[in-house]
Amino acid sequence: ESALITQQDLAPQQRAAPQQKRSSPSEGLCPPGHHISEDGRDCISCKYGQDYSTHWNDLLFCLRCTRCDSGEVELSPCTTTRNTVCQCEEGTFREEDSPEMCRKCRTGCPRGMVKVGDCTPWSDIECVHKESGTKHSGEVPAVEETVTSSPGTPASPCSLSG
């Protein structure tokens, strides 16, 4: 992949001193896994397992690798060209509107609803009304309202081991 990231793509506080105008789009850029030296002459490798860059760039520093939080598992480690990939532990999920933390999946659906989707690292269980088939809003019901899987139902991947 030969997409480019230049100083202009960064927030003002991340930018280095302005570079001279380049005669071709990639002149003066360094490959993924590298950053440019302060004098703009050399390409310096990112530090394996510590930082990375994903595109051709003129960054003065590589980007710091993400550390997986507790409650997350590391799917793949940080390399010089790819950030760490973290995923919520089994039984938890990360919502788009609260990506900063993993939330516990519900253990069952409210009364009058059936489960049609399992807990995954990126979504809670999915419930629909038995009759209408419309989805539930997703609020966790009171415990006494919860309908849990019957003994004959296969356990979902997000069933909590307690």
């Epitope: 480019l4 071709s24 490959p31 050399d42 490798s45 010089t80």
Partner: antibody, heavy 120, light 107 residues
Framework: QVQLVQSGAEVKKPGASVKVSCKAS????????IHWVRQAPGQGLEWIGW????????KSNEKFKDRVTLTADTSTSTVYMELSSLRSEDTAVYYC?????????????WGQGTLVTVSS | DIQMTQSPSSLSASVGDRVTITCKAS??????AAWYQQKPGKAPKLLIY???TRHTGVPSRFSGSGSGTDYTLTISSLQPEDFATYYC?????????FGQGTKLEIK
């Protein structure tokens, strides 16, 4: 499998230019950086520069910057290294080499080498 | 430029011996060190990169270690086909530089 096949040996006079080719096969040509490394008789290895066919990015060793031209023809998956103003100390085997992975600049695949002799 | 100083420059050893070659960088190269084997009239062959990662197909008797400025290539039990010249390389910063080589000869 990955192969880098270089052009044949050359004999040149001091002050002349030489153009060495390196034809790549067995992988997507535009995905990997190609490097040029030379080795004078009985001596060690010296990095000349790289060419990345994906965006025509070139990085040259300052020592050769004014004399080396790196180009490519993507239609034939061939990279070229031209060295001008040749002198006797440029007598060496010139190798093209490909990165082992996309952007880690260590060289897992090498051409067979092209001997360039500079002699009056 | 980063200088890579390799030692020894030559070494005599016997089949079955354990051999160690060292490389010292003039500055920290953050484990971005590679090792190559070269036989006369042939192109170099990559053995190790990122200081300790063995290249595909390289026998397990070859191992690399080190960090900062000091790197080592070890051959645990020399085989007849291992007699060759070995080079270290820093792949940390352009211009990439190599050690001057260690010629491993049969005792």
């Amino acid at each position: 499998q990955v192969q880098l096949v270089q052009s044949g040996a050359e004999v040149k006079k001091p002050g002349a230019s030489v153009k060495v080719s390196c034809k790549a096969s067995g992988y997507t040509f535009t995905d990997y950086i190609i490097h040029w490394v030379r080795q004078a008789p009985g001596q060690g290895l010296e990095w000349i520069g790289w060419f990345y066919p994906g965006n025509n990015n070139i990085k040259s060793n300052e020592k050769f910057k004014d004399r080396v031209t790196l180009t490519a023809d993507t239609s034939t998956s061939t990279v070229y290294m031209e060295l001008s103003s040749l002198r006797s100390e440029d007598t060496a085997v010139y190798y093209c080499a490909r990165n082992e992975d996309n952007y880690g600049n260590f060289f897992g695949y090498w051409g067979q080498g092209t001997l360039v002799t500079v002699s009056s | 430029d980063i200088q890579m100083t390799q030692s020894p420059s030559s070494l005599s050893a016997s089949v079955g011996d354990r051999v160690t070659i060292t490389c010292k960088a003039s500055q920290d190269v953050n484990t971005a060190a590679a090792w190559y084997q070269q036989k006369p009239g042939k192109a170099p062959k990559l053995l190790i990169y990122w200081a300790s990662t063995r290249h595909t197909g390289v026998p397990s008797r070859f191992s690399g270690s080190g960090s900062g400025t000091d790197y080592t290539l070890t051959i645990s039990s020399l085989q007849p086909e291992d007699f060759a010249t070995y080079y270290c390389q820093q792949h940390y910063s352009t211009p990439y530089t190599f050690g001057q080589g260690t010629k491993l000869e049969i005792k």
